[in-house]
Interface confidence: low
Amino acid sequence: LRLLDFPAPVCAQEGLSCRVKNSTCLDDSWIHPRNLTPSSPKDLQIQLHFAHTQQGDLFPVAHIEWTLQTDASILYLEGAELSVLQLNTNERLCVRFEFLSKLRHHHRRWRFTFSHFVVDPDQEYEVTVHHLPKPIPDGDPNHQSKNFLVPDCEHARMKVTTPCMSSGSLWDPNITVETLEAHQLRVSFTLWNESTPYQVLLESFSDSENHSCFDVVKQIFAPRQEEFHQRANVTFTLSKFHWCCHHHVQVQPFFSSCLNDCLRHAVTVPCPVISNTTVPKPVADYIPLWEPRSGSSDYKDDDDKGSSHHHHHH
């Protein structure tokens, strides 16, 4: 979690002098309670927006918007504390709107916005707006909270953000899997326009339980420029056990921008439905998955480099 450093955030508006300050997330009114406190925010809305940094990078940001209730408590409203909590890490970041003038009722409802919290792909946040001063102990709460889920890098707008592009979001490998004779599986995918090595990881499971019964890793060496966007093929020899038939295939790139932390693409191949005539055929009903960057199969030095097939169809 961080704040955009450009442009400087603004909370002043017509009829209100205001400044945005960094906050420790512990407003003074928690420690020194006041007798008269304002009511809670109304209609808190969180939306995904996108912002450019001075360096030209594009980042997802949380756009926070809320309005004030039309009651007399606005006379005691001294500001607001905005808090964003990243749920998987418990990391919290806060800013404070400090009102430098008294609010007065006017012909339209007071509305506030803030769009400077930079968020990460595929993360969930709890956004809280606390009106200040905070209430006395056992007083009515004067905050409103909402959860906000940031889409992953498969989302069209997210795909072109700096954190997603850095992890390889623009590459679509279009993985296909084909079962062959003699316990073999052929994996094909489209190479990206970078001379980078790839790994193809196969893990097989039994149909009846989630029991891993076979795994192998194969290396594809960095393609030459003329091979960019071509199809690469890797053929795996599968376990001889017929019950070891549920296959999970991952393609892991090593792009220079993310090295070992690139987004992986995966497909699963279910066990075949047993029928009278079982003819090997392309698997059409695999389930495409978008794997997170971290995973249990990070780069191993003992991958099976010797038996990798690297064919290109021109």
Epitope: D5, S167, S195, A222, F254, L259, D261, Y299
Partner: antibody, heavy 118, light 107 residues
Framework: EVQLVESGGGLVQPGGSLRLSCAAS????????MNWVRQAPGKGLEWVSF????????YYADSVKGRFTISRDNAKNSLYLQMNSLRDEDTAVYYC???????????WGQGTTVTVSS | DIQMTQSPSSLSASVGDRVTITCRAS??????LAWYQQKPGKFPELLIY???TLQSGVPSRFSGSGSGTDFTLTISSLQPEDVATYYC?????????FGPGTKVDIK
């Protein structure tokens, strides 16, 4: 402004320990892998360690493997290098460095000096 | 592990001269190579990445070429401010080894 600031260097006896820190600002630290690189007095650059954005992948140079531990706290925008069983040859300026999208390391700290001597 | 070597280890040239530094990898590394400039008492600065791409803000007199095992850094017209040590570095796979450096000064 994109910035890396190292701290924690100092004088330590052989066999001792130090913990280096690198404070990052001006960019989304949690989106970037990070590296430690060192430079012994009058010598060239030596890559020391790498940690991926979410700590899922970690690498060390053979010369420090088993003695140094790289870690990060994305909540605090900080990178760390725990150095144990220090030797004379670990005396160097230690830099933290951010990989560039596309390759190389485009953001470096000013460095912190570690002196191992009895 | 892949070893990186640089030649020459040092050179002296006149202002305006064309200067060439070579870097060799013991195995192919495609174009996963960066060049850095380090002035005395300063931290290194990225000049070239992906073997031939000029880093933003770096003067155009610097250029890089090569792929696989042999790489070259060229300064087309040496300037007094180019006095420094130049390092190559591979980054295709760990360890992300640096070359031993080439010290450049003015005659």
């Amino acid at each position: 402004e994109v910035q890396l600031v190292e701290s924690g260097g100092g004088l330590v006896q052989p066999g001792g320990s130090l913990r280096l820190s690198c404070a990052a600002s001006g960019f989304t630290f949690s989106s970037y892998s990070m590296n430690w690189v060192r430079q012994a007095p009058g010598k060239g650059l030596e890559w020391v360690s790498f940690i991926s954005a979410r700590s899922s992948t970690i690498y060390y140079a053979d010369s420090v493997k088993g003695r140094f531990t790289i870690s990060r706290d994305n909540a605090k925008n900080s990178l760390y290098l725990q150095m144990n069983s220090l030797r004379d040859e670990d005396t160097a300026v230690y830099y933290c460095a951010r990989p560039k999208v596309g390759g190389g390391m485009d953001v470096w700290g000013q460095g912190t000096t570690v002196t191992v001597s009895s | 592990d892949i070893q990186m070597t640089q030649s020459p280890s040092s050179l002296s040239a006149s202002v305006g001269d064309r200067v060439t530094i070579t870097c060799r990898a013991s195995q192919g590394i495609s174009n996963y190579l960066a060049w850095y400039q380090q002035k005395p008492g300063k931290f290194p600065e990225l000049l070239i990445y992906a073997a031939s791409t000029l880093q933003s803000g770096v003067p155009s007199r610097f250029s890089g070429s090569g792929s696989g095992t042999d790489f070259t850094l060229t300064i087309s017209s040496l300037q007094p401010e180019d006095v420094a040590t130049y390092y190559c570095q591979k980054y295709n796979r760990a360890p992300f080894t640096f070359g031993p450096g080439t010290k450049v000064d003015i005659k």
